[in-house]
């Protein structure tokens, strides 16, 4: 359903551990919205 990808994971971090903390669609949006901006992803200026 969602097409979000990361280039790398932090220490001791797994994709499963990230997803387990995102309990709702809004959490998912908030998490990746900031990631896109801070990492220059999406359509960063």
């Amino acid at each position: 359903k969602h097409k979000c990808f990361r280039n790398s994971l932090e220490n001791n971090e797994t994709l499963e551990s990230i997803m387990n903390t995102l309990e709702s669609e809004e959490d998912f949006r908030k998490y990746f919205y900031y990631l896109e901006g801070s990492k220059g992803g999406g359509g960063s200026k």
Epitope: E36, G41, S44
Partner: antibody
């Protein structure tokens, strides 16, 4: 230059329909989520609707859900708002606005159109 | 929905003096997973669309004068104009983008005393 040019406002009777357009230039349109925000005369700002860069995901305020439809044509770099069953309380300046860094979701807005006035009155 | 409440509704400040606008959200807009506040500030002059000033509560948009600053966290936020200039006369709005529907404060009108 980077800009959003709006068209399509005007006077419409209650219950009528209107389609607003927002033509984008100066940036890769499909890379950004877009929104419509309105402002009733002399009042504050109200977020109305948003759409992802691909057009796959849409979002609406409760006040317009089921009456308004947001869409985009990335081949034409144009955003649309189809407004049906219009009410007097929909009278406002409608702005299109661009998200600064996300194609998937709207958030805040770094580029705005000049606005187009929609008046719903008999 | 998250309600945004600004205070005061209007304020008059002398040129060169400090202007402070407050914004309070009905629930926290701080996301614990990244410790970021999902809050933006805009300036709107008569007959013009809004202009983005601040996002993530305290990050100044490119090209915005450094006399504009944002602070706060959780539910309480402040926009400060450190030395008011004539061109700063406008209405200022806060906006939360923590959850949909995104909501704005009612606006604060800043005038010259």
């Amino acid at each position: 230059q980077v800009q959003l040019v709006q068209s399509g406002g005007g006077l419409v009777q209650p219950g009528g329909s209107l389609r607003l357009s927002c033509a984008a230039s100066g940036f890769t349109f499909s890379n950004y989520a877009m929104s419509w925000v309105r402002q009733a005369p002399g009042k504050g700002l109200e977020w109305v609707s948003a759409i992802s860069g691909s057009g796959d995901n849409t979002y609406y305020a409760d006040s317009v859900r089921g009456r308004f439809t947001i869409s985009r044509d990335n081949s034409k770099n144009t955003l649309y708002l189809q407004m049906n069953s219009l009410r007097a309380e929909d009278t406002a300046i409608y702005y299109c606005a661009k998200d600064p860094h996300s194609s998937r979701w709207p958030g805040f807005f770094d580029l705005w159109g000049r606005g187009t006035l929609v008046t719903v009155s008999s | 929905d998250i309600q945004m409440t600004q205070s005061p509704d209007s304020l008059a400040v002398s040129l060169g003096e400090r202007a402070t606008i407050n914004c309070k959200s009905s629930q926290s807009v701080l996301y614990s997973s990244n410790n970021q506040n999902y809050l933006a500030w805009y300036q709107q002059k008569p007959g013009q669309p809004p202009k983005l000033l601040i996002y993530w509560a305290s990050t100044r948009e490119s090209g915005v004068p450094d006399r504009f600053s944002g602070s706060g966290s959780g539910t309480d936020f402040t926009l400060t104009i450190s030395s008011l200039q004539a061109e700063d006369v406008a209405v200022y709005y806060c906006q939360q983008y923590y959850s949909t529907p995104y909501t704005f404060g009612q606006g604060t009108k800043v005038e010259i005393k």
